[in-house]
């Protein structure tokens, strides 16, 4: 994602929201959308949502994926709908190749 500076009147995007912070809502509005995967005791927990404040997501979105966590961010209405965060393949530290295959 480009390291663009926050605007004075930042554009807000509609994002899919799935996870612990969503309550009963299935969407949220923010300056960035995200899709994340975290490993909790060996179980895959997928979440989607938004960062209301640009700075809030800036560091998170730039964190490279680790064996236990991956986050992918985007800007655009519903841009996280078809994004599934993926853990890095062994020996790599970037998303794009899955560590798993659905069989």
């Amino acid at each position: 994602m480009e390291d663009e500076k926050p605007k004075v009147n930042p554009k807000l995007y509609m994002c899919v929201c799935e996870g612990l912070s969503c309550g009963n809502e299935d969407h949220c509005e923010g300056q960035q959308c995200f899709s994340s995967l975290s490993i909790n005791d060996g179980f895959h927990v997928y979440q989607k949502g938004c960062f209301q404040v640009y700075e809030q997501g800036k560091m998170t979105c730039k964190t490279p994926p680790s064996p236990g966590q991956a986050v992918e961010c985007c800007q655009g209405d519903w841009c996280n709908r078809n994004i599934t965060a993926q853990l890095p393949t062994k020996g790599k530290s970037f998303p794009g190749t899955q560590n798993f295959h659905l069989e």
């Epitope: 612990l20 909790n40 895959h44 798993f100 295959h101």
Partner: antibody, heavy 118, light 106 residues
Framework: EVQLVESGGGLVQPGGSLRLSCAAS????????MYWIRQAPGKGLEWISS????????YYPDSVKGRFTISRDNSKNTVYLQMNSLRAEDTAVYYC???????????WGQGTLVTVSS | DIQMTQSPSSLSASVGDRVTISCKAS??????LNWFQQKPGEAPKLLIY???SLQTGIPSRFSGSGSGTDFTLTISSLQPEDFAIYFC????????FGPGTKVEIK
């Protein structure tokens, strides 16, 4: 077809050790996290361990941490559970299970019975 | 740790009945919940994952619902092969199973 076959159960004295094995087939073993779950006779289910694809990350609840060790051999398509310092309350059927990334514990083995008694 | 409770602990029903089983979490687990069926001498079998998704090969009479702390497994028309114990399972944090609900023949 996914198959998980546990072995290694039996009768062991309190304080003793046992190693369980789970032989997997029907899927690309090295691509999946694996799990052990147990069930005491007539009781509920308890998750006791998980291991990631290359064996570099392992997870345990407090009830077995420091006594049980999960490991895997991807060349043999097998996951293991080394159980030390066994107690009477560890008596249970031990199941091996696998997930797909978005479907936890989708497949289970038939289980192997471990009895800890003097 | 997140505690899971199920109600009722057992129930008696007849073939063709609509059966509902409740599972409650002690804190928010969103939809990170599965339902399993277990028959005597057998391993648990996955019925529902992610609260409401039907596992492949499971009859459509089984359905799940809920989010947050309250979840329900429904069997729309009980069949003879459905008499078993049903467990819920949460994997949001510190994976835990519910104590089970035994469905018996009336």
């Amino acid at each position: 077809e996914v198959q998980l076959v546990e072995s290694g159960g039996g009768l062991v004295q309190p304080g003793g050790s046992l190693r369980l094995s789970c032989a997997a087939s029907g899927f690309t073993f090295s691509n999946y996290y694996m799990y052990w779950i147990r069930q005491a006779p007539g009781k509920g289910l308890e998750w006791i361990s998980s291991i990631n694809t290359d064996g570099g990350s392992t997870y345990y609840p407090d009830s077995v941490k420091g006594r049980f060790t999960i490991s895997r051999d991807n060349s043999k398509n097998t996951v293991y559970l080394q159980m030390n310092s066994l107690r009477a309350e560890d008596t249970a059927v031990y199941y091996c299970a696998k997930s797909t990334p978005n479907i936890p514990l989708a497949y289970w083995g038939q289980g192997t019975l471990v009895t800890v008694s003097s | 740790d997140i505690q899971m409770t199920q109600s009722p602990s057992s129930l008696s029903a007849s073939v063709g009945d609509r059966v509902t089983i409740s599972c409650k979490a002690s804190q928010n687990i969103y939809k990170y919940l599965n339902w399993f069926q277990q028959k005597p001498g057998e391993a648990p079998k996955l019925l529902i994952y992610y609260s409401n998704s039907l596992q492949t090969g499971i009859p459509s009479r089984f359905s799940g619902s809920g989010s947050g702390t309250d979840f329900t497994l429904t069997i729309s028309s009980l069949q003879p092969e459905d008499f078993a114990i049903y467990f819920c399972f949460q994997y949001s944090s510190g994976p835990t199973f519910g104590p089970g609900t035994k469905v018996e023949i009336k």
